[in-house]
Interface confidence: medium
């Protein structure tokens, strides 16, 4: 399973960034990961 | 305009310390998410540790090489990142690069400095 | 730790030229690979993230694909430009990995 904190984030928030997959629905202006560090 | 400039580098000799810094400017550094990437002289990149943005907690991850002997930080205040480096090895000689990141789910945002030079030699 | 594997090491091709690189990691890492390109003294510059998405600035001729352990970038048309070393990496798990790079040369 992914265990960067980038996959525990977006499993917390219930979303995940284009970066990894999958596009979120509305903008937040939090960082929701570091799948390109 | 975004920079990133990293500072500190030099000539150490084995088992000795060096504190790195880089100076971010041109963007909101609190939110973003930075890591240390080292490059030996002609080889590849390695990733060394990386600090969460001020609201993750500022948690960190380090790489199990170097884990123990350096520390990443952060001063949200003044924009600066650091890295602690001890016990310092031949093995660590590499250009030291700064990487800021962010990811705003529709699209991200990634940040290099120039690098400093560390060379770790008696 | 996840190992990256990239292929071939060395690529001679000439401008006009499609070149595509590969990078085979140990274990699955869906899509979170990236691809830097870089040039002799200069910092790595970001590519591709999330394997298929074209970082800000990025011209169309380079494109990423791929998805668990196999990956591809393409350059579609070479331009003089794009001679240099190209890294994927992945950040699926820590520590995060590179590969040990591409050098796409002038034939």
């Known amino acids: 399973a992914c265990d960067t904190a980038t996959c525990v984030t977006h499993r917390l928030a219930g979303l995940l960034s284009r970066s990894g997959g999958v596009v979120k629905n509305n903008f937040v202006p939090t960082n929701v990961g570091s799948k390109a560090f | 305009e975004v920079q990133l400039v990293e500072s500190g580098g030099g000539l150490v000799q084995p088992g000795g310390s060096l504190r790195l810094s880089c100076a971010a400017s041109g963007f909101t550094f609190s939110n973003y998410w930075i890591s240390w990437v080292r490059q030996a002289p002609g080889k590849g990149l390695e990733w060394v540790a990386e600090?969460?943005?001020?609201?993750?907690?500022?948690?960190?991850h380090y790489a199990e090489a170097v884990k123990g002997r350096f520390t990443i930080s952060r001063d949200n205040a003044k924009n600066s990142l650091y890295l602690q480096m001890n016990s310092l090895r031949a093995e660590d000689t590499a250009v030291y690069y700064c990487v800021g990141y962010f990811d705003y789910g529709l699209a991200i945002q990634n940040y290099w400095g120039q690098g400093t030079l560390v060379t770790v030699s008696s | 730790e996840i190992v990256l594997t990239q292929s071939p090491a060395t690529l001679s091709l000439s401008p006009g030229e499609r070149a595509t690189l590969s990078c085979k990691a140990s274990?699955?890492?869906?899509?979170?690979v990236s691809w830097y390109q870089q040039k002799p003294g200069q910092a790595p510059r970001l590519l591709i993230y999330g394997a298929s998405n074209r970082y800000l600035g990025i011209p169309a001729r380079f494109s990423g694909s791929g998805s668990g352990t196999d990956f591809t970038l393409t350059i579609s048309s070479l331009e003089p430009e794009d001679f240099a070393v190209y890294y994927c990496s992945q950040s699926y798990n820590y520590p995060y990995t590179f590969g040990q790079g591409t050098k796409l040369e002038i034939k």
């Open positions: 274990k699955r890492v869906t899509t979170y």
């Open positions: 600090i969460r943005s001020e609201s993750d907690a500022s948690a960190t």
